[in-house]
């Protein structure tokens, strides 16, 4: 999947199973990321879920679980809010679209996640206090999770690569993280149809065309243009909104 | 099976972890996978099975040939960061101020600078 | 939630033969070693066999060596215990377990080897 | 093979009283690395078994705090701080450190 890290990095990683995207004292999201056609490098989000830990006199311990073609508007023990505490309420799910999107206020914590089913798979977006971010006590998962440190090097796809490749008039196959490029989708095509829904054309729009080339699905575009607007909702510094790739002096560096 | 948490100290010793080294930063880039490969070593028992550990131990090769690092010579010590409290150590209230994140906030200093993140597509 | 589902247990004749299957879902199967254990009736636990997330190593304890095979097929989420030359003692439930340590287990399936 | 002996083998417990079971291996599971690879399983009556306690002292998502987990070398405890009607059944310990991999013979616990 595609990731935008708290310190507005953009990778696209090919991390495979169950990753660690959030885990400080008071909060735990994993994912688990599945290929997108077999044999594929490029993977996308099947699995998620989130632990709100025991706090104070504030919440219970909470466990979200969401998967494809099931996005709770629960909790997995089917409540709604914090428990049974004196603040129960500054924990609270709220069914956007039901069964397509959800949103979760951890007031006690000032943080607000979006999950979202577009197409097979799932999409996360988080606004989180930096003094949240950092509160990690146990050193040794120091630092463990994507969302503060991004994706290892040996696990990210340099899309930029691909899509000078891809822009090329006969490209290589080997250009393709996937072994299977559906032909039915040129580039024009996924370039105008991304257009439509993201005209800036920044590192959202980059990853847009780099789904459809990938995949040929274009619930892909969705995904991207929520992603964008979860981001407008999410981002405290609105000027940062819109990443754009900086010059590859390094490799492997995305934005 | 602690792999990722091998993972995690290798992407905090190196920084953002989204950068190849400088040629001047090789030397402790070299330090931080000798350190890699020894925890990955440690979690061999437990995860040697296991896809993550494999693509660990295969991706310190990689990169230790890439960066011409050799096997032996000084690792890395992690990096330790000042914490703030944690949430069970902070003064217990009966009252819903404690559980309302900007209120409690404002009692103390400016506004919290907020940060975001995001997973999507493939 | 993870989830093991063992099947393919039954009554077996001394030196027959059974396959088990273990049927797993709610994790990347692919990327997990998985493990055989057995119980047999009243007693306690003991480890069979292991195999790699791709199947490149398998390792098995002594009593059962030359005479199980474990396998996998990766494709299907499946894990497989192919039980040969059958023994009186081999009587147990079997589990299969996920993890190169094993951390969830299925619910077993009772495998009965009498005349 | 490592031989793990665990005791008492029967264990009689009060409701809300601690419990302890003891497990001894025939020879240290603290590997040339400093770790040690000793877990803990529950197996609940008519249930399947489930992971409590790994590496020592860890325990899984999902268990209760009641339930801790300490020793080193050789010898090792699980300790139960108030033991609930849902603790019923036996306790088995398991070395990961030596191949081949090895289970005690168990504990069963039962409410007085």
């Known amino acids: 999947p595609h990731l935008r890290t708290f310190t507005d990095h953009f990778q696209t990683c090919k991390v495979q199973g169950a990753w660690p995207l959030i885990d400080n004292n008071y909060l735990n999201v994993q994912v688990t990321n599945t290929p997108v056609l077999p044999g594929s490098a490029a993977t996308a989000t099947s699995k998620l879920t989130i632990i709100f830990k025991n706090f104070q006199e504030c919440v219970d311990q909470k466990v979200y679980q969401a998967e494809m073609d099931e996005l709770p508007s629960a909790f997995a023990d089917g409540s709604k809010n914090g428990g049974d505490k004196h603040g129960a309420n500054s924990l609270k799910i709220t069914e956007k679209v039901s069964g397509q999107h959800v949103e979760i206020q951890a007031k006690y914590i000032g943080t607000t996640i979006v999950v979202r089913q577009v197409g097979r798979y799932l999409t996360f977006a988080v606004r989180m206090p930096e003094e949240v971010v950092n509160a990690v006590e146990d050193r040794d998962s120091q630092g463990l999770y994507l969302c503060l440190r991004g994706c290892p090097l040996n696990q990210q796809i340099d899309f930029q690569a691909f899509r000078a490749n891809a822009e090329s008039p006969r490209r290589p196959a080997a250009a393709s993280p996937s072994p299977v490029v559906p032909e039915t989708f040129p580039y024009e095509t996924a370039v105008a149809k991304c257009k439509e829904k993201l005209p800036v054309e920044d590192l959202y729009y980059q990853a847009c065309v780099f789904d459809l080339l990938t995949t040929g699905d274009v619930n892909f575009t969705l995904a991207a243009y929520y992603a964008l607007e979860d981001g407008k909702m999410l981002h405290s510094n609105k000027d940062k909104l819109h990443l754009f790739e900086r010059t590859r002096e390094l490799p492997g560096a995305v934005a | 099976c602690k792999i990722l948490k091998c993972n995690s100290e290798f992407w905090s010793a190196t920084s953002s972890g989204s950068h190849a080294p400088a040629s001047d930063d090789v030397p402790e880039f070299c330090a931080a996978l000798r350190t890699y490969a020894l925890c990955t070593r440690r979690t061999a028992r437990t995860c040697r099975g296991d896809l993550a550990y494999h693509s660990a131990v295969h991706g310190i090769e990689d990169l230790m040939s890439q960066h011409n690092c050799s096997k032996d010579g000084p690792t890395s010590q992690p990096r330790v960061r000042t914490l703030p409290p944690a949430g069970d150590s902070q003064e217990r209230s009966d009252s819903p101020e404690i559980c309302h994140y900007e209120k409690s906030f404002h009692k103390h200093s400016a506004a919290p600078n907020y940060t975001h993140c995001g997973l999507f597509g493939d | 939630e993870v989830q093991l589902v063992e099947s393919g247990g039954g009554l077996v004749q001394p030196g027959g033969s059974l396959r088990l299957s273990c049927a797993a879902s709610?994790?990347?199967?692919?990327?997990?070693?998985m493990n055989w254990i057995r119980q047999a009736p009243g007693k306690g636990l003991e480890w069979i066999g292991m195999?790699?997330?791709?199947?490149?190593?398998?390792h098995y304890a002594d009593s059962v060596k030359g005479r199980f095979t474990i396998s996998r097929d990766n494709s299907k989420n499946t894990l497989y215990l192919q039980m040969n030359s059958l023994r009186a003692e081999d009587t147990a439930v079997y589990y299969c377990?996920?993890?190169?340590?094993?951390?969830?287990w299925g619910q077993g399936t009772m495998v009965t080897v009498s005349s | 093979d490592v031989v793990l002996t665990q005791s008492p083998l029967s264990l009689p417990v009060t409701l809300g009283q601690p419990a302890s079971i003891s497990c001894r291996s025939s020879?240290?599971?603290?590997?040339?690395?400093?770790?040690?690879?000793l877990e803990w399983f529950q197996q609940r009556p008519g249930q399947s078994p489930r992971l409590l306690i790994y590496?020592?002292?860890n325990r899984f998502s999902g268990v209760p705090d009641r339930f801790s987990g300490s020793g080193s070398g050789t010898d090792f405890t699980l300790k139960i701080s108030r033991v609930e009607a849902e603790d019923v059944g036996v306790y088995y310990c398991?070395?990961?450190?030596?191949?081949?991999?090895?289970f005690g013979q168990g504990t069963k616990l039962e409410i007085k």
């Open positions: 377990a996920k993890g190169t340590t094993p951390d969830y």
């Open positions: 709610g994790f990347t199967f692919s990327n997990y070693g």
């Open positions: 195999i790699y997330y791709d199947s490149s190593e398998k």
């Open positions: 020879q240290s599971l603290e590997t040339s690395d400093g770790d040690t690879f």
């Open positions: 590496e020592v002292s």
């Open positions: 398991f070395q990961v450190t030596h191949d081949p991999v090895t």
